[in-house]
């Protein structure tokens, strides 16, 4: 309606003896600025007089001036817009209806507001969700209908009546919507916050209490459990009798079903308050609990651990690491199941028991080959002993040990021989799985670990095999020692150093390089005749018959040996020098007569002179002498001497005669 | 490098209580047994005793009721007593490491105890 | 306790001949026995183990042998250096020395 003033407040504002009220208020006039402003308290209009009745608690003058007993209200507002009041303190007979009497220039206007003084502080007023589950957080309002900027209050959250820990907010409103406090609470409740009393509580600027509201906590959650066990620590024996109630402490809702669990999985046909579990085995060990539901849900109670206890159970060894290597390190453990656990340990190795062991682990910080073997053991808790097991086996990898090579041939072995060798060994973890030889040959290896050697060299010193798995183990080196034949006999001239001369004093040596066996025996020879047996041939003085071709053999048990044949070479002046003629020593004149100077010589005559019988040496030099024609007058002695590099010789007197031919006969 | 030093006091009184200390390095003493060995001025070697990996002890028959082997082995040491000591009693005394199956390697140059007034 | 009894107390050989030195216990000891080699003012050195297992670095005319109570140990050609004393040591049960043979040079 656009004849009505238009105004914006509160309808009803709420306070209580000696606070103060303060109204948000605003307005919109009908033409122009306010001129007047009177506060009315429960006005009531006078036809008569055309205007309104009853107590002015405020009253503006067109000066603006406030008469001083009126300081109680105070007009907060302007001409045209505002129309905010304050009421410092209020007074419980301030209650009822509040009139704004508003005149402008031309139009008048009364507006109302309810005021509702209490005599004392009127509560809060708290809200709750309409339901609230245990651990999901819900927000509690407490509410009050009440602000004021000149009267400052506060709201305290209380548990059971002890303030809670937990952080409130607190708002306030004072539009002209509405005027309020409000604090607002997060809050996770628990089952146990069930049946507890929460309170707002309002409180003045200091702290002293005004006013409370109470509701209580209606917190739905799943059943609240606890379990009994008889006996209480929940240790038994095989045999015994064990027996766990379940005890619900608090469920909101009401309780609908009870079961019971071990270890996680329901127990069939267990429905009932108390599991009595009778004569125990240690399989029904394990965390036993009970779980009762209701509409929010199952309740589980805590785990009891039931330890049923039996002496420790035939056992079983873990070895790291099997199979090991010499040398590396080896654990051992002992796995027995008993409750309590195994106290002690006794270990045994084939049998055997080992002195010291008394631990669920043992250590062999370098494993040899008589390591290996079963080993077991025998757990004992304070219930009994238990049975050994059956063990677990170690092996224990190694090279193989103390190889030798023999050899298979009856000894001693010659030159020539098949030599038949065996690479052996004491052990060997794993097995051998070849064989290698040194040094290294076109040998024969007819089976494995065995080798053959076809026609043994002389030189064949030694021989070492060794036998592989893994790894190879070498055997020291084994000595053939070859019987041989003398090797390399030759004949060698010890003196003279230079070349033989007729009369010197020569020596000769049969040299040989080896010999296996070293006895040996030497023997000379000259033309198949047999000169001497010594190592050495010796000549006091040498002649010429003594030069030819000679031999020395060198024996020993295996055989003999030959040197190659080796010539002896005398070195003389010629000797034996002759004149011989041919074709006679007569010669008719006029024939042909020839003159050889014939000489046993080495090296052989290398010049010639001949000699008439006048010793008068002839102009010819070489070894034949040729007179043709011949004449009578060449009769006579001749003698020639024959020249080498080792000196001269000459022969004897030859006669040559020269007869007359019958023709110079005839002349005559 | 396995090390084994033996210390403790050079002379003791007769009926005193001889105490040795064996230090070991190189190795653990969760590993290896520890035996005391002991060898008087030109006679043979004597076994006293061992203290295993374990901890647990035995003793040479003879000697049992006065000897106490124990040890720590987060310090490396093994400790021997011996109570009521006699002139008879003066020898080298040597800790030796050794393990099950396997014989003792390693010797310390031991240390010499003399009994005396 | 295990005794072991060696033999003979002193043994006079030269260098180069053969040593056998003997050792008898007083059970079986299944082949837990070592050989010890000691000179004056050292301590003893480890020739054998397990009967017959050389200690390395010992020299191969070191052998040894035998089994159940009787054991051997043999040096096959005297080294000057040799010449010292010998123990057996059983590690079987427990361990006990044996009283020790002195080898000395003839």
């Known amino acids: 309606d656009s004849s009505k003033w238009v105004f914006e407040h509160p309808e009803t504002l709420y306070a209580w003896e000696g606070a103060c009220v303060w109204i948000p208020c605003t307005y919109r006039a009908l033409d122009g600025d306010l001129e007047s402003f009177i506060l009315f308290h429960n006005p009531e209009y006078n036809k008569n007089t055309s205007k309104f009745d009853g107590t002015r608690l405020y009253e503006s003058t067109k000066d603006g001036k406030v008469p001083s007993e009126q300081k109680r209200v105070q007009f907060l507002g302007d001409k045209n817009k505002n129309c905010t009041l304050s009421i410092h303190p209020v007074h419980l007979n301030d209650s009822g209806q509040l009139g704004l009497r508003m005149e402008s220039k031309t139009e008048k206007w009364m507006e109302r507001i309810h005021l509702n003084v209490s005599e004392r502080p009127f509560p809060p007023h708290i809200q709750l969700p309409p339901e609230i589950q245990e651990s999901q957080e819900v927000t509690l309002t407490c509410l009050l209908n009440f602000s004021c900027y000149g009267y400052p209050i506060q709201l305290q959250w209380l548990l059971e009546g002890v303030p809670m820990r937990q952080a409130a907010v607190t708002s306030t409103s004072l539009t002209i919507k509405s005027v309020f406090t409000r604090s607002e609470l997060k809050f996770s409740p628990q089952w146990s916050h069930h049946g507890k009393i929460v309170t707002c509580q309002l409180q003045d600027a200091d702290g002293k209490f005004l006013s409370n509201d109470t509701v209580q906590l209606n917190v739905k959650h799943t059943p609240k459990l606890e379990i009994k066990v008889t006996p209480s620590d929940a240790i038994v024996r095989e045999g015994d009798s064990v027996t766990m109630t379940c005890e619900v402490s608090s469920s909101n809702p009401e309780y609908t079903t009870v079961s019971w669990l071990k270890d996680g999985t329901s127990l069939k046909k267990q429905n009932t308050f108390t599991l009595n579990l009778r004569e125990v085995t240690k399989d029904q060990s394990g965390k036993y609990c009970c779980q009762v539901s209701n509409d929010v849900g199952p309740g589980r109670s805590e785990e009891v651990f039931l330890q049923v206890q039996y002496a420790p159970e035939p056992s079983t060894v873990q070895i790291l690491h099997s199979p090991a290597v010499e040398g590396s390190q080896v654990e051992f453990l002992c796995m027995s199941l008993a409750n309590p656990l195994p106290t002690n340990y006794t270990w045994y190795h084939n049998g055997k028991e080992m002195q010291g062991r008394t631990e669920e682990k043992v250590h062999i910080p370098k494993i040899l080959p008589w390591h290996a073997g079963t080993y077991s053991c025998v757990a004992e808790n304070i219930l009994g002993t238990g049975q050994r097991g059956p063990g677990a086996e170690l092996d224990v990898q190694y090279p193989p040990k103390k190889v030798t090579t023999v050899i298979q041939n009856p000894m001693p072995i010659r030159e020539g021989d098949t030599v038949t060798l065996s690479c052996n060994y004491n052990s060997s973890n794993p097995s051998v799985t070849r064989y290698e030889w040194k040094p290294h040959g076109a040998w024969e290896e007819p089976s494995l670990g065995v080798l053959k050697i076809q026609n043994v060299g002389w030189d064949n010193t030694t021989i070492a095999c060794a036998a592989c798995n893994s790894w190879c183990s070498w055997a020291s080196p084994v000595a053939l020692n070859v019987q041989y034949a003398p090797r390399d006999v030759r004949v060698r001239k010890i003196k003279p150093l230079s070349e033989i001369h007729s009369g010197n004093s020569v020596s000769l040596q049969c040299d040989f390089s080896s010999s296996h066996p070293k006895e040996v025996q030497f023997f000379w020879e000259k033309n198949g005749r047999l000169l001497g047996k010594e190592s050495q041939l010796n000549f006091d003085s040498i002649s010429p018959e003594d030069a030819g071709s000679y031999s020395c053999w060198v024996n020993n048990s295996i055989g003999q040996t030959a040197s190659k044949a080796w010539t002896l070479e005398v070195l003389y002046a010629p000797r034996r020098l002759r004149v011989s003629m041919s074709p006679g020593d007569q010669v008719m004149e006029g024939k042909s007569a020839t003159l050889t100077c014939e000489s046993d010589a080495n090296p052989p005559v290398s010049h010639y002179t001949w000699f008439d019988w006048n010793n008068q040496s002839l102009p010819y030099h070489s070894q034949k002498l040729r007179l043709e024609p011949v004449k009578v007058q060449h009769s006579g002695a001749y003698w020639c001497q024959g020249t080498n590099s080792v000196g001269k010789g000459r022969s004897p007197l030859s006669t040559l005669t020269v007869y007359y031919s019958p023709e110079t006969i005839g002349r005559r | 490098e396995v090390q084994l030093k033996e210390s403790g006091p050079v002379l003791v009184k007769p009926t005193e209580t001889l105490t040795l200390t064996c230090t070991v390095s190189?190795?653990?003493?969760?590993?290896?047994?520890i035996s005391w060995i002991r060898q008087p001025p030109g006679k043979a070697l004597e076994w006293l005793g061992v203290?295993?990996?374990?901890?647990?002890?035995n003793y040479n028959s003879a000697l049992k009721s006065r000897l106490t082997i124990s040890k720590d082995n987060s310090k490396s040491q093994v400790v021997l007593t011996m109570t009521n000591m006699d002139p008879v009693d003066t020898a080298t005394y040597y800790c030796?490491?050794?393990?099950?199956?396997?014989?003792?390697?390693?010797w310390g140059q031991g240390t010499t105890v003399t009994v005396s007034s | 306790e295990i005794v072991l009894t060696q033999s003979p107390a002193t043994l006079s050989l030269s260098p180069g001949e053969r040593a056998t030195l003997s050792c008898r216990a007083s059970?079986?000891?299944?082949?837990?026995i070592a050989w010890y080699q000691q000179k004056p003012g050292q301590a003893p050195r480890l020739l054998i183990h397990?009967?017959?297992t050389r200690q390395t670095g010992i020299p191969a005319r070191f052998s040894g042998s035998g089994s159940g109570r009787d054991y051997t140990l043999t040096i096959s050609s005297l080294e000057p250096e040799d010449f010292a004393v010998y123990y057996c040591?059983?590690?079987?049960?427990?361990?006990?020395f044996g009283g020790g043979t002195k080898l000395e040079i003839k």
């Open positions: 040591l059983q590690y079987d049960n427990l361990l006990t």
């Open positions: 030796v490491p050794h393990y099950y199956g396997y014989a003792m390697d390693y």
């Open positions: 203290i295993w990996t374990g901890g647990g002890t």
């Open positions: 397990y009967t017959s």
């Open positions: 190189g190795f653990s003493l969760t590993s290896y047994d």
């Open positions: 059970q079986d000891i299944n082949k837990y």
